[in-house]
């Protein structure tokens, strides 16, 4: 589910026509072009496994395939966080792990992957068709989420292989961080190419390679994902979602998430992947953790008359670094 942009293949000029200076001038544009072409988006993979020993026990494993430092991970079920999903756990690399029943044991497996054991019975018991989602907030990529569920026919003890399920959602800082550098590089590249064009230099020859040649993964949403904005939220059957959780659905307002399960009925072996459109930026990157709690499937329960919404509790040290990571 990546948006891809075609990049025309450029041929270097024939040697000897511009001399050493020309070669040196063109090294930087080629490096920048390579960066522009190969720069990819991070990915999140989700693996859901039902334990053979206990049919009501699930293990969810999630990982982040990106170069940034992870500042928060949120695991939810019943759909993406903030779109009807209910938070099961929040894992902060500096502050610890906050989890809600029926989550039993959330933990970091590596610097970029986590696992969560779910146990339950009755109303708070997950079942095979429950969708589990993992959202990784990282710097500078922003916030990325993917979802998965057990294939309906899978045997206990088996699991779908971890499948990368990227989502085209990046918070402002992620876009400005990585994309900003790339955008600057690409603009500079075009500037150099334009300068180069205005000289009596040799022309760029028509491509002799396949038109499918290098492809750049773009940050902008594709037409398909833009169309997703107009698609009503489609939830995989989650009849086993809990009725007794302390966390409930997010409060009012339209959801910015529009999800499109990418797996078809005839292809049930992989976890569900969810596409989404970039959501409006919330002002600053530090607000990602606020957002996670503000949409984390909370109820505003039994609140007194004066309850108002504030930025989420992170303590006074929260601003010392991205999401309190110092």
């Amino acid at each position: 589910m990546r948006t891809e942009a075609q990049v025309p293949a450029l041929q270097p000029p024939e040697p000897g026509l511009e001399g050493a200076m020309g070669h040196r001038t063109l090294v930087l544009p080629w490096v920048l072009l390579t960066l522009c072409v190969t720069a990819g988006t991070p990915e999140v993979w989700v693996q859901v496994r039902m334990e053979a020993t206990e049919l009501s026990s699930f293990t969810i494993r999630c990982g982040f395939l990106g170069s940034g430092s992870i500042s928060l991970v949120t695991v939810s079920w019943g759909g993406p966080n903030g779109a009807g999903g209910t938070t099961l756990a929040v894992l902060h690399p500096e502050r610890g792990i906050r989890q809600w029943a029926p989550a039993r044991q959330a933990r970091w497996e590596t610097q970029s992957s986590i696992s969560l054991i779910l146990e339950g019975s009755g109303a708070s018991s997950p079942c095979a068709n429950t969708t589990f989602c993992c959202k990784f907030a990282s710097f500078p990529e922003g916030s990325w989420e993917a979802c998965g569920s057990l294939p309906p026919s899978s045997d206990p003890g088996l699991s779908a292989p971890p499948t990368p399920a990227p989502i085209l959602r990046a918070d402002l800082a992620g876009i400005l961080g990585v994309s900003g550098v790339l955008l600057f590089g690409c603009v500079y590249l075009l500037h150099l190419l334009r300068r180069h064009k205005h000289r009596p230099a040799p022309r760029l020859q028509p491509s002799r390679t396949s038109p499918q040649a290098p492809r750049a993964r773009a940050w902008a949403p594709s037409q398909a994902s833009q169309a997703a904005l107009h698609v009503p939220y489609a939830t995989i059957n989650t009849s086993c979602r809990p009725a007794t959780l302390d966390t409930a659905h997010p409060h009012g307002g339209p959801s910015w998430w529009a999800s499109l399960p990418t797996h078809a009925a005839h292809r049930p072996q992989g976890p569900a992947a969810w596409a989404s459109t970039p959501i409006p930026a919330r002002g600053s990157f530090v607000s990602v953790e606020n957002g996670l709690y503000a949409q984390a499937g909370e109820r505003p329960p039994h609140t007194g008359p004066g309850l108002t919404l504030f930025p989420d509790p992170r303590g006074p040290r929260a601003m010392e670094g991205p999401l309190g990571v110092r």
């Epitope: 500096e94 989890q99 970091w108 709690y293 504030f310 930025p311 989420d312 303590g315």
Partner: antibody, heavy 120, light 113 residues
């Protein structure tokens, strides 16, 4: 300075409910989760649950899940903990405590405690 | 839930001497991400609420005298009072602050010999 002031001692009959309050001052109230911890006479400490004052999000210890309700009134910077279906083993000192700014579950400021006695 | 076990239950130490209290957790409290151990120590004097002394196993809370020090990693932790003072008589609790629900040790009563 940070102050957490709790309501006074309570004597309740088995089966009744008790509601303890904790008024916070001296810091940004919405910025810290508030926790409730109890201590039976001569015993250790037991975590009951926590509440996010900024949005009312709660998280309860499984052992108390069906009997406890935590609420917040931001206009008075007060959190409440209500425990229902009281039994004699609920006799304890109940503390509210604020979480430490750099970790979710270390508790750096505590109320003075509220003794709840359950007796027939 | 993570089970915290303290030893000894009670301890008598002479004034000016070193006091050592141990705490063991049923699973590792070491966070692989930042290599911090999520273990806290509290002091509770009679009729008072607990007071945070140390968190992250060895980080002293502001205002806590430097005779109090925490050490250990993984599942085994120690609180050391280098030179016992009369005002240190109290019950000391360890607590894991790594994940929900936070759990406490049973406490160690420290007295003067």
């Amino acid at each position: 300075q940070v102050q957490l002031v709790q309501s006074g001692a309570e004597v309740k009959k088995p089966g009744a409910s008790v509601k303890v309050s904790c008024k916070a001052s001296g810091y940004s109230f919405p910025s810290y989760w508030m926790h409730w911890v109890r201590q039976a006479p001569g015993q250790g400490l037991e975590w009951i649950g926590e509440i996010n004052p900024s949005n009312g999000l709660t998280n309860y210890n499984e052992q108390f899940r069906n009997r406890v309700t935590m609420t917040v009134d931001t206009s008075t910077s007060t959190v409440y903990m209500e425990l229902s279906s009281l039994r004699s083993e609920d006799t304890a000192v109940y503390y509210c405590a604020r979480h430490h700014g750099s970790t979710y579950y270390a508790l750096d400021s505590w109320g003075q405690g509220t003794l709840v006695t359950v007796s027939s | 839930d993570i089970v915290m076990t303290q030893s000894p239950d009670s301890l008598a130490v002479s004034l000016g001497e070193r006091a050592t209290i141990n705490c063991k957790s049923s699973q590792s409290l070491l966070n692989s991400i930042n290599q911090k151990n999520f273990l806290a120590w509290y002091q509770q004097k009679p009729g008072q609420p607990p007071k945070l002394l140390v968190y992250f196993a060895s980080t002293r809370e502001s205002g806590v005298p430097d005779r109090f020090s925490g050490s250990g990693s993984g599942t085994d932790f120690t609180l050391t009072i280098s030179s016992l003072q009369a005002e240190d008589v109290a019950v000391y609790f360890c607590q894991q602050h790594y994940s929900t629900p936070p759990t406490f040790g049973g406490g160690t009563k420290l007295e003067i010999k």
